[in-house]
């Protein structure tokens, strides 16, 4: 009986994702075989959050405007171990939307969830950022320094990642 | 090649306003913020405040609050400021300058006198 | 605001004289140190920018350096054209602000 209405209780949990999310792919948590948690097929998962590399090119607005209807937003990228599980999806020769904005182009960039932005955790490439006409950041591939954040024009197409909260059901 | 062309000198009495006028050409205009630097006689340079060409929105230092307002129209390339309420403090050349990379503005304006007399 | 000093308001140099010129910010600027030139007609140009790039089409006899608060301008071969005021500027935050310039004499 216990068993029965556990089960119930994940079917309607995903039926609520399914009009974004036809299909999820779940693995279990733990010892507890009651802790499953999910992200939407065929995106990746990192610690407690989904991801998904858009490779439509998109403005930053129409990009955040894409991961919303997927139940996401522009990634907003916490630590350097995040970031370095994110690159292994990116190709060198692309640059990616982030969640990541100045739209007063006054220097006080924002996250789009509303995470303080911590100069101490952020990775632009040297001399980065450095003009008041670029609003919007990206994520890039430089031959000298790696992977790391670049500001550009915000109406340019670029491709983008997507962030989610993993599924738990 | 970049250019920057401003209106012509302007005398004008105290208390009324003036708008001068920087239209753009050789690049792509609403790529690139206009700001405004204001030179008294014989003194250092002051930076006024920044327009998006793009956007429309101002950024202006403190001290020019309320003394100025910045404009852009994009059909013809031209970026305005106009001075309200004006003083001899005014008296002053304005140049525009375009923004560039690095915080910096990268091409200026031949200035534009604005004489404030009675 | 960040101020910005030129403790030498006027140089006098002869040419082919090598001359530096100081700039000193009220806090650290994190390298977004510009110089301009502007000629006796008003005429402003960049220079340098980021503290040592050359803008282009300036002449290499240019140069700056720096780091943190202190920054100088050098002109290794001067030329009877560099006569003229010179303003370093930050734009590591707004409002952006200059120096007071230094002009910049023939002996």
């Known amino acids: 009986n216990f068993m029965y209405s556990k089960t119930v209780k994940r079917l309607s949990k995903l039926r609520e994702y399914q009009q974004y999310h036809p299909s999820l792919t779940c693995v279990m948590e733990g010892k507890d075989i009651e802790d499953w948690s999910c992200c939407p097929t065929p995106w990746t998962s990192f610690q407690s959050s989904c991801y998904f590399i858009s490779t439509g090119m998109q403005s930053w607005t129409k990009s955040q405007k894409n991961c919303s209807v997927m139940g996401a937003d522009l990634v907003v990228i916490n630590t350097r171990e995040e970031q370095d599980f994110i690159i292994q999806n990116l190709k060198r020769n692309s640059s990616y939307f982030l969640g990541l904005s100045d739209p007063g182009g006054r220097r006080h960039w924002q996250w789009v969830d509303q995470t303080p932005y911590n100069e101490n955790v952020t990775f632009w490439h040297s001399g980065e950022p450095n003009n008041l006409d670029e609003r919007c950041a990206i994520i890039n591939f430089r031959s000298s320094e790696e992977w790391g954040w670049n500001d550009i024009h915000c109406h340019v197409p670029q491709k983008s990642i997507c962030k989610m909260k993993k599924i738990y059901i | 090649q970049v250019q920057l062309q401003q209106s012509g000198a302007e005398v004008v009495k105290p208390g009324a306003s003036v708008k001068i006028s920087c239209k753009g050409s050789?690049?792509?205009?609403?790529?690139?913020?206009m700001h405004w630097v204001k030179q008294a006689h014989a003194k250092s340079l002051e930076w006024i405040g920044v327009?998006?060409?793009?956007?429309?929105?101002?950024n202006y230092n403190q001290k020019f609050k309320g003394k100025v307002t910045m404009t852009v129209d994009k059909s013809s390339s031209t970026a305005y400021m106009e001075l309200s309420r004006l003083t001899s403090d005014d008296t002053a050349v304005y140049y525009c300058a375009r923004n560039g990379n690095f915080y910096v503005m990268d091409y200026w304006g031949q200035g534009t006198l604005v004489t404030v007399s009675s | 605001d960040i101020q910005m000093t030129q403790t030498t308001s006027s140089l006098s140099a002869s040419l082919g004289d090598r001359v530096t010129i100081s700039c000193r910010a009220s806090?650290?600027?994190?390298?977004?140190l510009n110089w301009y030139q502007q000629k006796p007609d008003g005429t402003v140009k960049l220079l340098i920018y980021y503290t040592s790039r050359l803008h282009s089409g300036v002449p290499s006899r240019f140069s700056g350096s720096g780091s943190g608060t202190d920054y100088s301008l050098t002109i290794s071969n001067l030329d009877q054209e560099d006569i003229a005021t010179y303003f370093c500027q930050q734009g590591n935050t707004l409002p952006w602000t200059f120096g007071g310039g230094t002009k910049l004499e023939i002996k």
């Open positions: 806090q650290d600027i994190s390298n977004y």
């Open positions: 050789g690049y792509t205009f609403t790529d690139y913020s």
């Open positions: 327009i998006s060409t793009y956007y429309g929105d101002s």
